[in-house]
Interface confidence: low
C-alpha cells in the first residue's frame, strides 16, 4: 500500500504538471494570436485546442486500457500545424477562459476522485489490519483459555491420583493391621489351649494353607505387575489406562471362560457320579442275588 501511495502521488504530480503545461500552451497561443489577424488566430487556436483535447483523450483512453503507465514522464503534445483550420464565422468568439476553467475543473475532479479512492483503500486496509489484530488477540485469548482449562484438568487429575494413592495406602495399612490382629489372636488361642498335638496339627494345616496362599500370591504377583506411572505423561497414562482396561477385560473374559469350564466339569462330574452310583446299585443287587442263590 506504501508503493501504491507513492505511485498515486506521482500520478497526481504528473497530472498537475500536464495541466500547467496545457495552460502555458494556451497562454502562448493567446499571445501569438493577438499578434496575428483576429479571425484566423481564433480559428487556429480553436482547432489546436480541439486537437490537444483529442490527443489527451486518446492518451487517457490508452492509459485506461493498459493500466497505469510505468514511465511517469509527461508525453510531448503533437500538434499538426500544416493542416488548415476551418474558418470560424465572424461574430463567434472562442472563450479561452471558459475552456481553460472547464479543463481545470475536469482535472481537479479526476484528482479528487483519485485522492478519494486512495484514502478509501487506505481506510479499508486499516480496517482489515484492526480486524486482523482483533482476531489475533482473540485467538491468543482463546488459546490461553484452553491452556487454563487444560491446566485445571491436569491439576484435578493429579489430585484424583493422589487421593486414589492415599486411599489405597490407607486400605493396605488397614489390611495389614487386620492381619496382624488376627495372627495375634490365633497365636494367643493356641498358647492358651496348650494342646501340643492340636497345635502341631494346626501348624501343619496352617502351613499347608500358607503354601497354597503363597502359591496364590506368586501367581497374582506374576499377573499384577508393578504400576510404575509416575514418569508417564498424559498420553502415555491414557495408553496405560487403556492397556489396563484391556487386561481387565481379558481377565474377565478368561474368568468367564473358566467359570463356564468349571460348570461344565462340575456337570460332567455329577454325570459320572450318577453313573458310578447306578453301577454300584446294580453291582450290589447282583451280589445279593448271587448269595441268595448260593444259600438256597
Amino acid at each position: 500500500s506504501d508503493i501504491e501511495e507513492v505511485v498515486e502521488e506521482y500520478e497526481e504530480e504528473e497530472q498537475e504538471e500536464a495541466a500547467v503545461e496545457e495552460e502555458e500552451d494556451w497562454r502562448e497561443d493567446e499571445d501569438e494570436q493577438e499578434e496575428a489577424a483576429e479571425e484566423d488566430a481564433e480559428a487556429e487556436a480553436e482547432t489546436e485546442e480541439t486537437r490537444a483535447e483529442e490527443d489527451e483523450e486518446e492518451e487517457e483512453a490508452k492509459e485506461a486500457e493498459d493500466g497505469p503507465m510505468e514511465e511517469s514522464k509527461p508525453k510531448p503534445r503533437s500538434f499538426m500545424p500544416n493542416l488548415v483550420p476551418p474558418k470560424i464565422p465572424d461574430g463567434e468568439r472562442v472563450d479561452f477562459d471558459d475552456i481553460h476553467r472547464k479543463r481545470m475543473e475536469k482535472d481537479l475532479n479526476e484528482l479528487q476522485a483519485l485522492i478519494e479512492a486512495h484514502f478509501e483503500n487506505r481506510k479499508k486496509e486499516e480496517e482489515e489490519l484492526v480486524s486482523l489484530k482483533d482476531r489475533i488477540e482473540r485467538r491468543r485469548a482463546e488459546r490461553a483459555e484452553q491452556q487454563r482449562i487444560r491446566n485445571e484438568r491436569e491439576k484435578e487429575r493429579q489430585n484424583r491420583l493422589a487421593e486414589e494413592r492415599a486411599r489405597r495406602e490407607e486400605e493396605e495399612n488397614r489390611r495389614k493391621a487386620e492381619d496382624a490382629r488376627k495372627k495375634k489372636a490365633l497365636s494367643n488361642m493356641m498358647h492358651f489351649g496348650g494342646y501340643i498335638q492340636k497345635q502341631a496339627q494346626t501348624e501343619r494345616k496352617s502351613g499347608k494353607r500358607q503354601t497354597e496362599r503363597e502359591k496364590k500370591k506368586k501367581i497374582l504377583a506374576e499377573r499384577r505387575k508393578v504400576l510404575a506411572i509416575d514418569h508417564l505423561n498424559e498420553d502415555q497414562l491414557r495408553e496405560k489406562a487403556k492397556e489396563l482396561w484391556q487386561s481387565i477385560y481379558n481377565l474377565e473374559a478368561e474368568k468367564f471362560d473358566l467359570q463356564e469350564k468349571f460348570k461344565q466339569q462340575k456337570y460332567e462330574i455329577n454325570v459320572l457320579r450318577n453313573r458310578i452310583n447306578d453301577n454300584q446299585k446294580v453291582s450290589k443287587t447282583r451280589g445279593k442275588a448271587k448269595v441268595t442263590g448260593r444259600w438256597k
Epitope: D134, R138, E142, R143, Q146, I149, R150
Partner: antibody, heavy 114, light 111 residues
Framework: EVQLQQSGPELVKPGASVKMSCKAS????????MKWVKQSHGKSLEWIGD????????FYNQKFKDKATLTVDKSSSTAYMQLNSLTSEDSAVYYC???????WGQGTTLTVSS | DIVLTQSPASLAVSLGQRATISCKAS??????????MNWFQQKAGQPPKRLIY???NLESGIPARFSGRGSGTDFALNIHPVEEEDAATYYC?????????FGGGTKLEIK
Amino acid sequence: EVQLQQSGPELVKPGASVKMSCKASGYTFTDYYMKWVKQSHGKSLEWIGDINPNNGETFYNQKFKDKATLTVDKSSSTAYMQLNSLTSEDSAVYYCATRVFDFWGQGTTLTVSS
Amino acid sequence: DIVLTQSPASLAVSLGQRATISCKASQSVDYDGTSYMNWFQQKAGQPPKRLIYAASNLESGIPARFSGRGSGTDFALNIHPVEEEDAATYYCQQSNEDPYTFGGGTKLEIK
C-alpha cells in the same frame, strides 16, 4: 456448577426481530467468551459468533454479521442475541455456550411463521 | 472457511463392538503443537455434550471407552465397547480458525 439458562421458545412473524437471553451462573461471567450456535431442524451446528463479556467486544461468522447482534449485561451475568429481518430460514434452535464449547444452554427454539 | 467432512453419515454397530467415526478437515487445524479439534455427542432434544477436546483429551466424567486421535487434517473418534446409551449423533468441530465450524454429524445406532 456451571449453568446457562436460556429464555423460552419464540414464535414470530417474518420481517420481525427477536431478542433471546442466556443467564450464566456457577462461574465468573467475565472469565470466558459467550458463544452462540444455530441448529436448524435435523441439521448440523453453525457458529454465529462470540462476545467478550468484559468489554462487549464481538466476533461474528460473516454469514450472520447482518443477522445477529450480540450483547451482554455484566450486572446480571446475562448474554443476549438479537436476530433481525427474520425469515423462515431463521427457524432453528439457538444455543449459547461457554468455555470453548464446554458448557451449553438448553437452547431456545425460534419459529418464524406468518 | 475450514470445511469438516464426517464419515460415515450413519453407522449401526452391535453392542460391545467398536465404532469409529472419521473427520477430515479441508486444511490443518494444528497450531503450536496442539490440534484444535473437539468431538461432541448430541442426543435428541438435548444440547451437544463435549466428549473430547484438543483431538485426544477426554473430558472429565466421560467414560474411557471414548477416545480421540489424529492431527493436522485427519481425525477419528473411537467408541469401544459400544453401549446402548451411546446411540446419538456425533459432531467434530474445529476451534483453530474463524469461523469455528462443525462437521455434518454421524448418527450412531446400536444393533
